[in-house]
Each structure stands twice: as C-alpha cells, then as structure tokens.
C-alpha cells in the first residue's frame, strides 16, 4: 500500500493527477471506480479540505512520465477513512496513463479562485450545498436573502457545475452563520446569466441586512437518462448523466422491473422485454460506466429512485452495458 | 465483423518477412491489438501488442526481431532474419474494449514455413 | 519471467460430466487470468476474464474461480462441442511493461 501520495499538474497543490509512492517510487493510480468518495479521503489526507471532483488525470500537464507506473489498479474508499491507503485497492493488472485518476480539492488555505470575482457554498455538506459566498477583490462576503429567488439559485448552480437548483426552506444554522461582510441585496437574476456576479443588485456593501438573513442554496447534481443507438428515442443503449457526464449502465441485475421504470421515465409506453441478442445489437459504449448492480421495485418514477452501488463502482466492461427497448 | 491475416509463406532463413492483419468492420485504430504465433502442435505465445496510440509493447524475446506497424485499417508484424524455430501460425487478435491484454476478437491466422 | 503451470496436460471425461483444469502461477497475480478455448484449426476463444468474470455469450456451464497463484476453471455438464485445448493466461500491463503468458494448455476429450 502506498507510503506517499500527492497531485501533480495542477494550479495548485490541491489538484492534479494521483500520484502514490511505492517502496521508494512514484507512480500513479488507473481510474477504475475512482469516485468523489475516494478524492474525499485523498483530500482529507493532503490537508486540502473537501472534494471538489474527479477530473481525469491526463488533463494535467506535464503528463505521467513514460518510464511513470500506474501502481494501483482501483480503489475504493468509503469516503469516511483518513488515509488512500485504509481503502480497499486493488493491484494493478492492465492500465495505461491514459486512465490516470485526478482529483481536486477546495484548497482551504489557498487564495487561488478559479473565477477572478468568484462564487461559493459554504459550511454546507459538500461544494453544492451551502452559504452563499461571493469573492469580490480578494474578501469573501455573504449574500443577504432580501430579493433571493430561485432564478439566481440556479445561477449559481450553473457557475458551481453543480447542476440544478433544488428550492429549499433552509436557512443557515446558528453555527454557519456568516462571520463575513455582508456583500450585497436585492439580487435580480433572470436566472440566465452566467454568473451571480453578472445579475443586477443593490450596491455593493450597502444593507440593512445581518447574518441571520444570510442566503443559503442546495444544487443536486442532474440526473437524465437517454438511449442512443437505436431507431428512435424509446430504443437503445441506456446512458444516464452524472456530474455533467454521460456513462453506461452495467446489466449485472438487470431486468425487468429496470426495463419498465426506464420506459416510464422516458415516456416511452412499455417495456418490450428484449431478448440478451436484441439487447446486445446496439453495441457497446464508451467512457465511464456509472451505475452497477441496479435494482428496482418496479414503482419507482425515475431510474434515480432505485437501489444500485455507489456511483462509479462496478466490475465490468462496455460489453456488459444494458440496452432497453420500449415499446415508443 | 472480421480480422484476416495475410502474408504467411514460405521463406528463407534471414530474408524479411512482413505479415498484415486487416480488419474489417472493426475500428483498430483505437483499440489494442496483439499478435500471437503457435508452431504446429504447441501452445500459444504472445509476440507483441500496439495500442491505439501507437506505442508498442514486445515479448522479451520478440525485441528486435518483430516490429509492429498499423493504419486505420491494418496492422503489419514484420519479422526480420528469420530461423526455422520460427515455423508457425501467426494470428492477430484485439483486446477487449477498454482493456490492453486479453483478446476477444481473433483471426483465423496465416501459416509462416521457414526453410532454406 | 512469471510461469503458469497448466494441470492435466490431458484429461478424459464422459458427456454430462464434469472436468476441472487447474493453473498455477509462479508468483501471485491477483486476479490478471483469462481463460481460452481452441478447438483444431480453429483460433482462441474467450471465455473467462478477470480470474471469474463470464465472456458474453459463454454457457455458465464454464466457471473460473481463484486468485493469487491458484486458479480453476471449471467445465460442468460437458457436451461434445467442449472438445478442445484450453489454455489459461496471466495478463499485465502498468503503464510502461506488458506482460502476456500462457499456460502448456489441456486437451480435454469428451467420450
């Protein structure tokens, strides 16, 4: 198990590829399974605050050195261990740079904002729920909710890369009160902008507003579903959209109760109960596989709704991908 | 869906021998392909592989003496000074998709006779 | 370099019997092992990746099981059509080497 591990390539040190020490070398880690739980426990390891994502690795420059090993194959981590090394790994037995893990963090004590006037959520559980912050000339202030609405929520969902905007009673608890100034009120959004800082409001720093009033947002990652390949919208190779990308469903457990809440999702009539051939005619995918193991009482309204292993687990490949055909 | 050896043929000892893998109805140029030999009544070896970058990987003791070459729908194995322990079938093979080292799509193979 | 020992070399089983092939390696590799069948003048077949994991289109009457350094395949109610060599391979490839070994293989004869 590694002794050392560090990310490479990044703006900072909080970013990069995934790079472990093994008996004196570094080398790096194979994509497989590599969720934001992993990167959770990576940037907890590194000092480096939450998680903010899973890019893939060969995004940063310089890439892996030729002569670079990946060392480990997968790793799972349930998100709640201190060290990479506390999680379940597997050896590596076939993987290439081209499947270099990255990982991001928040890089708590770092004044790097990848957006010059930027946004953020904080005290909340994750980068997608929380205060709403706004970085204006070096100093984080806190939003007033006076003229909030949903339409800037989801602007700043947007600018977060944290999908849609949930509407929520919320409020900031007594103990995330912000201890900052309070930047502005009376936002204005169309919720088109594509930035918070791009809507109209009151004047910058000029409120009668206290912490009580601070604005706090939940975004949830989207979740959509589409089958490709087919003649039509109600056939083919089932992909569903997490964290901004799309990836193939494994058919380990498939069957069904899956086919019908696919079809009813999608508006698609009925389940046409193909058979393994059929299934298989519309070929493999390419690019991640999110979900494993998916089971389904057959009630549910949305592929979401049913159980499956965490996002990104699985022990397959694109020639186990599930392929649903309705009946249109 | 098919790969195809062609090539196979008698030649002599240290002449040069180029055999090609064509695909047909499958994209080689973004997968992995090997190339494997089995003299008559033996088991299976591994020569080498290309990837769909390019690079390539040999057996130890295929360095130097096989090169692998590919375009988007061939990939060539050329063998140079050949010896007569080198009689075989030659097959090429793709991995499966996403991986670079086991082979689900095999051609049938090309027979290479050495002898002077 | 890594051996894999094949075990029988030959082996002779009646129809709806069962046969088990085993396959050593000579240093753990966790789970790197696929499982191939050739039958005369005709090229490999996958049938097992990943030391267990069933090809598509494989009968599960073909099981592969183990890890480290002892693996197994597995053919249950044998048919006639399972005439063939089965050979075993260890796979390896970390960025920089490949490593791609077979087994001496088994014929098995079905009567």
């Known amino acids: 198990s590694p002794s050392g591990v560090r990310l490479v390539g990044g703006l900072h040190r909080c970013e990069g590829r995934v790079e472990v020490e093994q008996k004196g070398q570094w080398g790096t880690v194979c994509d497989d399974g590599w969720d934001i739980k992993d990167v959770a426990v990576l940037c907890r390891e590194l000092g480096c605050g939450a998680a903010s994502g899973t890019p893939s690795g060969i995004l940063y420059e310089p890439p892996a050195e030729k002569e670079q090993k990946v060392l480990i194959q997968s790793v799972s981590c349930t998100g709640t261990e201190d060290t990479l090394a506390q999680c379940e790994q597997e050896e590596v037995y076939d993987c290439s740079h081209d499947e270099d893990a990255g990982a991001s963090c928040e890089n708590p004590e770092s004044s790097f904002s990848p957006v010059p006037e930027g946004v953020r959520l904080a005290d909340g559980p994750g980068h997608c729920k929380g205060r709403v912050e706004v970085k204006h000339q070096n100093q984080w202030y806190t939003v007033c909710q006076t003229g909030w609405s949903l339409r800037a929520a989801k602007v700043v969902c947007r600018q977060l890369g944290c999908g849609r905007a949930v509407l929520t009673q919320k409020r900031c608890n007594k103990h995330a009160y912000g201890r900052k100034p309070i930047w502005l009120s009376q936002m204005s959004c169309s919720g088109r902008e594509a930035t918070l800082q791009d809507c109209p409001s009151g004047p910058w720093g000029k409120n009668t507003c206290n912490h009580d009033e601070d604005t706090w947002v939940e975004c949830e990652d989207p979740f959509d579903l589409r089958l490709v390949g087919g003649d039509n919208l109600c056939s083919g190779r089932l992909e569903v959209l997490h964290k901004g990308v799309w990836g193939s469903v494994c058919d380990d457990n498939w069957g069904e109760k899956e086919d019908q809440v696919v079809c009813k999702q999608l508006g698609c009539g009925k389940s046409l109960s193909p058979s393994f051939r059929d299934r298989k005619c519309y070929g493999p995918g390419v690019g991640r596989i999110w979900l494993d193991n998916v089971r389904c009482s057959g009630e549910e309204q949305s592929l979401e709704q049913c159980q499956h292993r965490f996002w990104g687990f699985h022990d397959c490949t694109h020639q186990e991908d599930v392929a649903v055909i309705c009946s249109g | 869906q098919s790969l195809k050896e062609s090539g196979g043929r008698l030649v002599k000892p240290d002449e040069t021998l180029t055999i090609t893998c064509t695909a047909s109805?499958?994209?080689?140029?973004?997968?992995?392909v090997g190339w494997f030999r089995q003299a008559p009544g033996k088991g299976l070896e591994w020569i080498g592989i290309i990837r769909g970058s390019g690079s390539t990987y040999y057996a130890t003791w295929a360095k130097g003496r096989f090169t692998i070459s590919k375009t988007s729908t061939t990939v060539d194995l050329k063998l140079t000074s050949p010896t007569t322990e080198d009689t075989a079938t030659y097959l090429c093979a793709r991995a499966f998709p996403g991986y670079n080292t086991f082979f689900n799509f095999w051609g049938q193979g090309t027979l290479v006779t050495i002898s002077s | 370099e890594l051996d894999l020992t094949q075990t029988p070399s030959s082996v002779e089983a009646a129809v709806g019997g069962t046969v088990t092939i085993k396959c050593q390696a000579s240093?753990?590799?966790?789970?790197?092992l696929a499982w191939y069948q050739q039958k005369p003048g005709q090229p490999p077949k996958l049938l097992i990746w990943?030391?267990?994991n069933l090809e598509s289109g494989v009968p599960p009457r073909f099981k592969g099981s183990g890890s480290g350094t002892e693996f197994t395949l597995t053919i249950s109610d044998l048919e006639c059509a399972d005439a063939a060599t089965y050979y075993c391979?260890?796979?390896?490839?970390?960025?920089?080497?490949?490593?791609?070994?077979f087994g001496g293989g088994t014929e098995v004869v079905v009567k």
């Open positions: 391979q260890r796979y390896y490839f970390n960025g920089v080497s490949v490593e791609i070994v």
């Open positions: 240093e753990s590799i966790g789970n790197a």
């Open positions: 990943k030391a267990s």
């Open positions: 109805g499958i994209d080689l140029t973004s997968g992995t």
